[in-house]
């Protein structure tokens, strides 16, 4: 019962993070006009993956695709990629976790399967869920750079001929939807790979004794017990596997500033 | 076609509020701000600020703020302004604008401050 | 605040001449972000609201005759009339449509000679 609901809650977990992950990368919002220098800004620029938008004093908001692929910088293009690769092999991951829950039955599948399925899931998902926070961490880290890039531009240059604020950027909404969204994908995964152990048979290896009609001789196979009791060396149908939930990636989060102009 | 309908001049003595509607056709009533100007006779355009009918947000002049305030209702796609404490320089023609670079505009209402 | 400035305050163009009017703002209205500059340019009526003829410095609105142009970039901006006729008889408005408050220039009132 309990694996069950660790596989379920896992696969739900997993599938809330995915739509994350995937409305994150559809969102424009992934850096914002920074408005500490600039508060009363009638123009408000904000930017995507995709696409650049501005939203002017009528409430009209344009927004202009870039229709560039060779002339984006190359951590963009880094960014979009670990997006795709996360929303790609969490869908399998998804597709591959129907098959193997507990709770459906699909014709004469052994539990071996499911957890092998289950498993293979969870893996994706944790890479999955890596490959986004990887992607939006890699975003954030280029927008504090350029943040402090424009900060130092904007006390150096012009020598104050001509008035013109240098737009800078900062964290958008899509960041946080798409660190807690990879976080749950993660967490979904571990949950999954859990779930798995859980799942595999438990093996029993009594072996028969073999009879030999020519002979007196009765040949016993020793080591039937190993199985059950869960320890000693077992390659037949349980994976060794590491739980792969590593923690060294930990998010640290900024303070954000809602203005609404 | 886009329109903006604006109520009809107002009489008023010193001290007293004044409240004037803007009634909205033709676009989406919450897609755009709505922005009211001030123009005394004789004088140029004064921005007093806007409404956001999506979101009730609002922005004002400093100059205003504390005297104008703006509101909207969806159902009747109508934005409001009412301007209290009024004072003799207050009289003058109150436009309601809308669009890219307001190119909407409401006929005007003349209001009066006179003892 | 950002302040307008007009000029000049009034011009007087035969018919048929070209008529240009400045408008200088305090600040930079280039907004970096979609490199264009927000500044409008109205013509207004006796009696009447005003019409809108330019915005993002030389953006024309449907329906403006194409004698009206706009030019400028950053602080100093022009609105070109390149062959005045009766109707074109107005006040003209720039305003700055970048930060808020928005401000509007003085007016200039064209005359024909």
């Known amino acids: 019962m309990a694996v069950t609901a660790c596989q379920g809650l896992g696969f739900v977990v997993s599938l809330i993070g995915i739509a994350g992950i995937i409305a994150a990368t559809c969102m424009d919002q992934w850096s914002t006009q920074d408005l500490y220098n600039n508060p009363v800004t009638a123009v408000f620029n904000y930017q995507g993956l995709w696409r650049s938008c501005v939203r002017e004093s009528s409430g009209f908001t344009e927004c202009r695709g870039y229709f560039t692929l060779l002339g984006l910088p190359a951590m963009l293009q880094a960014v979009r990629a670990l997006m795709i690769v996360g929303i790609v092999l969490g869908a399998i991951g998804l597709l591959v976790s129907i098959f193997a829950l507990k709770c459906i039955r699909i014709g004469s599948m052994e539990d071996s399967a499911k957890a092998n399925m289950t498993l293979t899931s969870g893996i994706m998902f944790i890479v999955s869920g890596l490959c986004a926070i990887a992607g939006v961490s890699v975003f954030a880290n280029m927008l504090v750079t350029n943040f402090w890039m424009s900060t130092a531009n904007m006390y150096t240059g012009m020598g104050g001929m001509v008035q013109t604020v240098q737009t800078r950027y900062t964290f958008g909404a899509a960041l946080f939807v798409g660190w807690v969204a990879g976080g749950l994908t993660l967490i979904g995964g571990v949950m999954m790979c859990i779930a798995c152990r859980g799942l595999a048979p438990e093996e029993t290896n009594y072996k028969a004794v073999s009879y030999h009609a020519s002979g007196h001789s009765v040949a016993y196979k020793p080591g039937g017990f190993k199985a059950s009791t869960g320890f000693g060396s077992n390659t037949k149908n349980k994976k060794i596997y590491d739980g792969g939930a590593r923690t060294e990636d930990e998010v640290q989060s900024y303070p954000s500033k809602h203005d609404y102009v | 076609q886009v329109q903006l309908v604006q109520s009809g001049a107002e009489v008023k003595k010193p001290g007293a509020s004044v409240k004037m509607s803007c009634k909205a056709s033709?676009?989406?009533?919450?897609?755009?701000?709505i922005h009211w100007v001030k123009q005394a006779p004789g004088q140029g355009l004064e921005w007093i600020g806007y409404i956001s009918p999506g979101n009730g947000g609002s922005n004002y002049n400093l100059k205003f703020k504390d005297r104008a305030t703006l509101t909207s209702d969806t159902s009747s796609s109508t934005a409001y302004m009412e301007l209290s404490r009024l004072r003799s320089d207050d009289t003058a023609v109150y436009f309601c604008?809308?669009?890219?670079?307001?190119?909407?505009w409401g006929q005007g209402t003349l209001v009066t401050v006179s003892s | 605040d950002i302040v307008m400035t007009q000029s000049p305050d009034s011009l007087a163009v035969s018919l048929g001449e070209r008529a240009t009017i400045n408008c200088k703002s305090s600040?930079?209205?280039?907004?970096?972000?979609?490199?264009?500059?927000?500044l409008i340019w109205y013509q207004q009526k006796p009696g009447q609201p005003p019409k809108l003829l330019i915005y993002r410095a030389s953006t024309r609105d449907s329906g403006v005759p194409d004698r009206f142009s706009g030019s400028g970039s950053g602080t100093d901006f022009t609105l070109t009339i390149s062959s005045l006729q009766a109707e074109d008889v107005a006040v003209y408005y720039c305003q700055n449509d970048y930060s808020y408050p928005l401000t509007f220039g003085g007016g200039t009132k064209l005359e024909i000679k």
């Open positions: 033709g676009f989406t009533f919450t897609s755009y701000n």
């Open positions: 600040q930079s209205l280039f907004n970096s972000g979609n490199q264009k500059n927000y």
């Open positions: 604008a809308t669009g890219r670079g307001f190119a909407y």
